[in-house]
Interface confidence: low
């Protein structure tokens, strides 16, 4: 349904508040270094223009595409060349190349200062003084740090952010009320950002087919009572929504997501019995709720899969007639029967099935050739099961912090060329799989753990892509989306790595370490641990443990000293010498 003016269409569909918020998110995700005030000015100009188009869709420039309008606006920024360097060259291009160019310059790890949380009273005063600016600033700060954050979901976060301040700024103990809510929003926000980043990577690096396969598997697990045709329709619509958001088309994305939520709720009887509560909520909450809804119960008496996909004489005929539809049906049928499998495992099984049919349907006796295809699935299923069992045992034995340390050593030895901050961040997140998933019963562990690990390893992949330093990381990240985790698991110690030169500066600490939070202290310790492994990749666990214990004790001692800085200087030299001796450096 073509509209004379796309900008007027979206403004009317979304309303002024959502329109302005989404344009701000879009601009902040593209120009991540621009000051808040500059973005607000641009957004206000776009909004005023949109209003003229609502009043008269035939007015000048109202027929232009959103990419043209937004790109033209971004290219008016005076400091584009100084601030962004070669990104300014995008402005010499025409659409759609210009937008593609902007997308390629999105930075997953922008050089921005860490967000420091002000005192509660300061935040409450700012909230009361100008609520609109306060919330816009939240959108801006999150969007520029997370350039692929799912925009309609960020509106939901902003709504919860506002609700937290509205409630807590009038509470007797503001801090006790507000801080846990802000912590929860921060942690959920990071998780949401990482999950969306994987969706965008799937679409951008592996194509629409890969994303659709993922969506078929996940939606079939979630809605096992829905017909294949219904799941296919949802997958098509969901793919459109995420393609738009990942492509920077945030107004279309938010609009289409609202339409999809509306469709799901209008057809919930043929989709899932679990949607009732979600569908009674307002729009933003409704969409979020649907995205997180629990799996429906499996229909009773589902027939064996073998009948249609192994025993039938029409397997090759059905496959040849419409390969992707037939494989989609296989994936749907397998996934709805297996909520206990990770999505990536289901996709590995579908890939194995596809490879077998490709080979066997060209053979002299196809049926004989593919008759045992399900036997090939057994090792694929057992590998993640065993891995999760072993790692959950280790997690239960060590606790989260020590488990993270074990992973830090493991991953630093696998890919020592990767930057220390990236290794620390990724290993800490990998280690969180224990707290997140090991508490679940067996039937829920694998989907929780392996699909979470896919999200975390994607963080490693996107950070590494910005500055590639390891062929092994590149290989695991690019060869197969669904085999990333097994690829990293299979990596052994990198024997080609030349140990890093010992640099005493790396292990020089100052009194500022004494005022850090528990989490920041852990990160300091873990950073030192990674550096130790980079210096001495063949160090035994015992050697590393011993040196790290002394290091931690040294910091403890100096933080209790009267003259902390002198203690750090003098004792630090002794520590470095002792560590070098202990590790044979």
């Amino acid at each position: 349904d073509a509209h004379k003016s796309e900008v007027a269409h979206r403004f009317k569909d979304l309303g002024e508040e959502n329109f302005k918020a989404l344009v701000l998110i879009a601009f902040a995700q593209y120009l991540q270094q621009c000051p808040f005030e500059d973005h607000v000015k641009l957004v206000n100009e776009v909004t005023e223009f949109a209003k003229t188009c609502v009043a008269d869709e035939s007015a000048e420039n109202c027929d232009k595409s959103l990419h043209t309008l937004f790109g033209d606006k971004l290219c008016t920024v005076a400091t584009l060349r100084e601030t962004y360097g070669e990104m300014a060259d995008c402005c010499a291009k025409q659409e759609p190349e210009r937008n593609e160019c902007f997308l390629q310059h999105k930075d997953d790890n922008p050089n921005l200062p860490r967000l420091v949380r002000p005192e509660v009273d300061v935040m409450c005063t700012a909230f009361h003084d100008n609520e609109e600016t306060f919330l816009k600033k939240y959108l801006y700060e999150i969007a520029r740090r997370h350039p692929y954050f799912y925009a309609p979901e960020l509106l939901f976060f902003a709504k919860r952010y506002k609700a937290a301040f509205t409630e807590c700024c009038q509470a007797a103990d503001k801090a006790a009320c507000l801080l846990p809510k802000l912590d929860e929003l921060r942690d959920e926000g990071k998780a949401s950002s990482a999950k969306q980043r994987l969706k965008c990577a799937s679409l951008q690096k592996f194509g629409e087919r890969a994303f659709k396969a993922w969506a078929v598997a996940r939606l079939s697990q979630r809605f096992p009572k829905a017909e294949f045709a219904e799941v296919s329709k949802l997958v098509t619509d969901l793919t459109k929504v995420h393609t738009e958001c990942c492509h920077g088309d945030l107004l279309e994305c938010a609009d289409d997501r609202a339409d999809l939520a509306k469709y799901i709720c209008e057809n919930q009887d043929s989709i899932s019995s679990k949607l009732k509560e979600c569908c009674e909520k307002p729009l933003l909450e409704k969409s979020h709720c649907i995205a997180e809804v629990e799996n429906d119960e499996m229909p009773a008496d589902l027939p064996s899969l073998a009948a249609d996909f192994v025993e039938s004489k029409d397997v090759c005929k059905n496959y040849a007639e419409a390969k992707d539809v037939f494989l989609g049906m296989f994936l749907y049928e397998y996934a709805r029967r297996h909520p206990d499998y990770s999505v990536v495992l289901l996709l590995r099984l579908a890939k194995t099935y596809e490879t077998t049919l490709e080979k066997c349907c060209a053979a002299a006796d196809p049926h004989e050739c593919y008759a045992k295809v399900f036997d090939e699935f057994k090792p694929l299923v057992e590998e993640p099961q065993n891995l999760i069992k072993q790692n959950c045992e280790l997690f239960e034995q060590l606790g989260e912090y020590k488990f993270q340390n074990a992973l830090l050593v493991r991953y630093t030895k696998k890919v020592p060329q990767v930057s220390t901050p990236t290794l620390v961040e990724v290993s800490r997140n990998l280690g969180k799989v224990g707290s997140k998933c090991c508490k679940h019963p067996e039937a829920k562990r694998m989907p929780c753990a392996e699909d979470y690990l896919s999200v975390v390893l994607n963080q490693l992949c996107v950070l590494h892509e910005k500055t590639p330093v390891s062929d092994r990381v590149t290989k695991c990240c690019t060869e197969s989306l669904v085999n990333r985790r097994p690829c990293f698991s299979a990596l052994e110690v990198d024997e080609t790595y030349v140990p890093k030169e010992f640099n005493a500066e790396t292990f020089t600490f100052h009194a500022d370490i004494c005022t850090l939070s528990e989490k920041e202290r852990q990160i300091k310790k873990q950073t030192a641990l990674v550096e130790l492994v980079k210096h001495k990749p063949k160090a035994t666990k015992e050697q590393l443990k011993a040196v790290m214990d002394d290091f931690a004790a040294f910091v403890e001692k100096c933080c209790k000293a009267d003259d902390k800085e002198t203690c750090f200087a003098e004792e630090g030299k002794k520590l470095v010498a002792a560590s070098q001796a202990a590790l044979g450096l």
Epitope: N405, K545, D550, A553, E556
Partner: nanobody, 134 residues
């Protein structure tokens, strides 16, 4: 797994001395931070003294500083607590604890080592009774 066995407890008059020993087996003793803790009747277990893997970092609770000395002999897989000038308030069951330093029982930052080491001990002995009478 590491097994810890304490010995050397007993009854003594105020002002007297005792030397507690803690023998470890089943692990790489030299890589563990070790600590002594005590629990008086009706009270929580409290940190007394701790020593890092190499013996280069040592800590004491304020109430025993100058009276107690912790040491370790990695060749013998043993940690010691020499207790002099004992007081009736030192009466308690004394436990030996080992903290796996891969988990870095000695935490970073301004909080005293006892809070962290006590909470993060991976292994404990059965305890030895010390009674100081006036």
């Amino acid at each position: 797994d590491v097994q810890l066995v304490e010995s050397g407890g007993g009854s003594v008059q105020a002002g007297g001395s005792l030397r507690l020993s803690c023998a470890a087996s089943g692990g790489t003793f030299s890589s563990y931070a070790m600590g002594w803790y005590r629990q008086a009747p009706g009270k929580e277990r409290e940190f007394v003294s701790g020593i890092s893997w190499s013996g280069s970092s040592i800590d004491y609770v304020d109430s025993v500083k100058g009276r107690f000395t912790i040491s370790r002999d990695n060749a013998k897989n043993t940690v010691y607590l020499q207790m002099n000038s004992l007081k009736p308030e030192d009466t308690a069951v004394y436990y030996c604890g080992a903290a796996d330093p891969m988990g870095l029982g000695y935490g970073l930052g301004p909080r005293p080592v006892d809070r962290l080491l006590s909470a993060e001990c991976d292994y404990w002995g059965q305890g030895t009774q010390v009674t100081v009478s006036s």
